[in-house]
């Protein structure tokens, strides 16, 4: 602790100019004071001034008023500093002396004589208010006041609490009257060294180094660091914990970039045709009559369905068509014949068979020919036999399908797997994705093709639950849990009714 006992001398009266021994001063009592402050004693005794002592220069002769003086010789109030916890009690001895000698340092002069003394014992609390008193004896009167105040930076009832206001990285505070810290705005903690982050900043996922700031820890984002960052490359997915990629409805794949519902998302089929999903980014359009093309985007002519029979020629009209029949035929579609076998109506070596007692006929066509009169060469591509966008080509009596890259089979109905050539090393599992094969690697390997042996095995700690298989290698330091039926989650920790369509990335 540290404080100051202050004594303010106000007035001393010694009208007769007498000493304590009854003698008078000549020409007058040139008066100075000795003050002794010590611990409380019920009976004041001689001995060391344990709390301090001080002397004044000559302040006046016989009777005088003592003026306040802030510095130099004759300072008033008198200061008695102490460097301990103020006990709240004290004993004070004030002696008035006459000196025949030096005005400034009278206590060193020989021949000094006591005029009078007073003794005060009691309790005194620390505070700014002066306690005023007056002491009389038969010859003299002394008016004075006193108090105890704490030294700069000391606080509390006994001046025992040290507090120095500061505004640096070891504290941002001012000092309360009791010495406790009062944090400056934006700061908290015992020493006011902890910044108060932006209101709402997530306690675990965010932090700050200065007030009203919110810095996100790895894996989190947003103004309040309450939004997780999904796995890098996650396209149509979300996360509930960082680096997750939980696919939105209709999307699949490790990065949720496989469109499982292309029909709904893109509506590729035009002109009222029916769209059917057929795997990632796959779909087929079933056209309404009168339309064709991969997306049913091409309108057919009314004659496109070859409605005219027996070699009739078709003419498009505004909302319909008209058949011009060859000789011997009539009807809307030239379906009625006036010919008989006698007219040799069958072309291309077709055999004529009479019907209805010779009033009509039917042609039996040789291979590769068709039509009522065998007049049409068979087009084996008419039925669109080639799947997955394959091109149909007539080859004499047969036809072949020319397949798009990635498909094979007589009708291009088979998908050629990128995984067929086993691109994954070290027992990695291959997944056919839109942009090529992706390998999920066994423990201890990573890289696009599981070709890199890694020293840190992310699977070593057994992070996958419920019997899931752990793979590494999707990206450095990552692992993948391939969940068994009935479990999902980055570590296959959540039971559900349906199996996940792809492994989850942790």
């Amino acid at each position: 602790g540290s404080g100051i006992f202050q004594l303010r001398l106000q007035e001393f009266v010694n009208q007769r100019g007498m000493l304590a021994n009854g003698q008078s001063c000549e020409p007058g009592c040139r008066t100075f004071f000795r003050i002794c402050l010590k611990h409380f004693q019920a009976t004041f005794s001689e001995g060391p001034c344990t709390f301090g002592n001080v002397s004044t220069p000559v302040l006046g002769t016989n009777s005088f008023v003592v003026r306040d003086k802030n510095s130099g010789s004759g300072r008033n109030p008198l200061q008695l500093p102490f460097n301990f916890t103020w006990p709240g009690t004290f004993s004070l001895n004030i002696q008035a002396w006459h000196t025949p000698g030096d005005d400034l340092r009278p206590e060193t002069s020989p021949g000094n004589s006591l005029i009078s003394q007073i003794i005060i014992q009691g309790s005194l609390a620390v505070g700014k208010i002066w306690r005023t008193d007056e002491q009389n004896d038969t010859l003299t009167r002394l008016s004075y006041s006193y108090r105890v105040i704490c030294s700069d930076n000391y606080y509390g009832e006994s001046c025992s609490r040290l507090c120095k206001k500061r505004d640096d990285h070891f504290g941002h505070y001012e000092c309360q009257p009791d010495g406790s810290l009062s944090c400056l705005p934006g700061w908290t903690g015992k020493y006011c060294d902890q910044p108060i982050c932006l209101s709402g900043c997530h306690e675990q996922n965010g932090y700050c180094s200065k007030p009203d700031e919110c810095i996100c820890r790895p894996g989190w984002q947003g103004r309040l660091c309450n939004e997780c960052i999904p796995h890098n490359g996650c396209r149509h997915g979300t996360c509930s914990i960082p680096w997750q990629c939980a696919c939105d409805e209709g999307w699949g794949g490790l990065f949720c970039d496989q469109d499982l519902n292309y029909c709904t998302h893109h509506s590729p089929c035009k002109n009222g045709s029916t769209c059917s999903n057929s795997g990632p980014k796959g779909y087929t359009c079933t056209c309404l009559p009168g339309y064709t093309g991969e997306h049913c985007e091409l309108g057919l002519s009314k004659c496109a369905s070859n409605p005219c029979r027996n070699g009739g020629s078709c003419k498009d009209q505004e909302n319909s068509y008209h058949c011009l029949c060859p000789p011997g035929y009539y009807g809307q579609h030239c379906e009625h014949s006036t010919l008989t076998c006698a007219d040799s109506p069958c072309f291309n070596g077709g055999s004529c068979r009479e019907r209805n007692q010779g009033s009509s006929y039917a042609c039996e066509c040789p291979p590769n020919f068709t039509g009522s009169n065998c007049e049409k060469k068979v087009d084996r591509c008419t039925s669109n036999p080639c799947a997955n966008g394959g091109q149909c080509q007539n080859r004499g009596p047969s036809r072949t399908c020319r397949c798009r890259p990635g498909f094979t089979g007589t009708h291009c109905e088979l998908h050629i797997s990128d995984c067929a050539r086993s691109p994954c090393a070290h027992g990695g599992t291959c997944h056919d994705l839109e942009n090529g094969p992706v390998c999920t690697c066994p423990a201890g390997f990573s890289g696009r093709r599981c070709e890199v042996r890694i020293t840190h095995d992310a699977c070593a700690s057994g992070p996958c639950f419920n019997g899931a298989t752990c793979y590494t290698g999707l990206s450095p330091n990552n692992f993948v849990c391939n969940c068994p039926y009935g479990f999902v989650g980055s570590r296959c920790e959540f039971p559900v009714g349906l199996p996940p369509s792809f492994p989850w990335v942790a």
């Epitope: 020493y191 060294d193 932090y207 180094s209």
Partner: antibody, heavy 121, light 106 residues
Framework: EVQLQESGPGLVKPSETLSLTCTVS??????????WGWIRQPPGKGLEWIGD???????YYNPSLKSRVTISVDTSKNQFSLKLSSVTAADTAVYYC?????????????WGQGTLVTVSS | SYELTQPPSVSVSPGQTASITCSGQ??????ASWYQQKPGQSPVLVIY???KRPSGIPERFSGSNSGDTATLTISGTQPMDEADYYC?????????FGYGTKVTVL
């Protein structure tokens, strides 16, 4: 008990960058209430405070060195580092790392043993 | 920039009291720390918060700080106290060391 250990090259060429790392053991660098500081002492001379950092990455530098100093922290490794660029012979000194304690009003209660860095071609 | 001034050297006889001063503008309004450094060793904190001793520091080390001066006092100085002593304070966010005082025990 907390221990600090400086590491880095003992010889650096003029105009190059001095790089030192302080590894903390026996306590977490992520604890609040501490700053982690660098102090240097040229041969036969007094101590000079270089700068400090806390776990959140808040840095404070001596204004006389600020343009050349970078202090960083790696909480995962329980380390903090000093980089001093464009060094000259005047940067030859024993470099200490130390823990500064808020409770001790910024006093440094734990110090590394120091590492001498000489700047010479 | 803020400066702390110390006497270069102080000599004391064994058993006597050594006082080392550290002066700086309004230093009494800042917290002063004192460090002891023996040749070839790292500094050791002997006083913090003007007058407090860390555990393990002998009672003969004491400190005070008011006005413009902080003082480290070694009562009953022993030969093992011979060392360099540095005062330190914080000026806003910058650590400042005194120039150091070499204490010689005669």
């Amino acid at each position: 008990e907390v221990q600090l250990q400086e590491s880095g090259p003992g010889l650096v060429k003029p105009s190059e960058t001095l790089s030192l790392t302080c590894t903390v053991s026996g306590g977490s660098i992520s604890s609040s209430g501490y700053y982690w500081g660098w102090i240097r002492q040229p041969p036969g001379k007094g101590l000079e405070w270089i700068g400090d950092i806390n776990y959140a990455g808040s840095t404070y530098y001596n204004p006389s060195l600020k343009s050349r100093v970078t202090i960083s922290v790696d909480t995962s490794k329980n380390q903090f580092s000093l980089k001093l660029s464009s060094v000259t012979a005047a940067d030859t000194a024993v470099y200490y790392c130390a823990r500064e304690d808020v409770i001790l009003r910024g006093g440094s209660d734990y110090w590394g043993q120091g590492t001498l860095v000489t700047v010479s071609s | 920039s803020y400066e702390l001034t110390q006497p270069p050297s102080v000599s004391v006889s064994p058993g006597q009291t050594a006082s080392i001063t550290c002066s700086g503008q309004r230093l009494g309004d800042k917290y002063a720390s004192w460090y002891q450094q023996k040749p070839g060793q790292s500094p050791v904190l002997v006083i913090y918060e003007d007058s407090k001793r860390p555990s393990g520091i002998p009672e003969r080390f004491s400190g005070s700080n008011s006005g413009d001066t902080a003082t480290l006092t070694i009562s009953g100085t022993q030969p093992m106290d011979e060392a360099d002593y540095y005062c330190q304070a914080w000026d806003r966010d910058t650590g400042v060391f005194g120039y150091g005082t070499k204490v010689t025990v005669l």
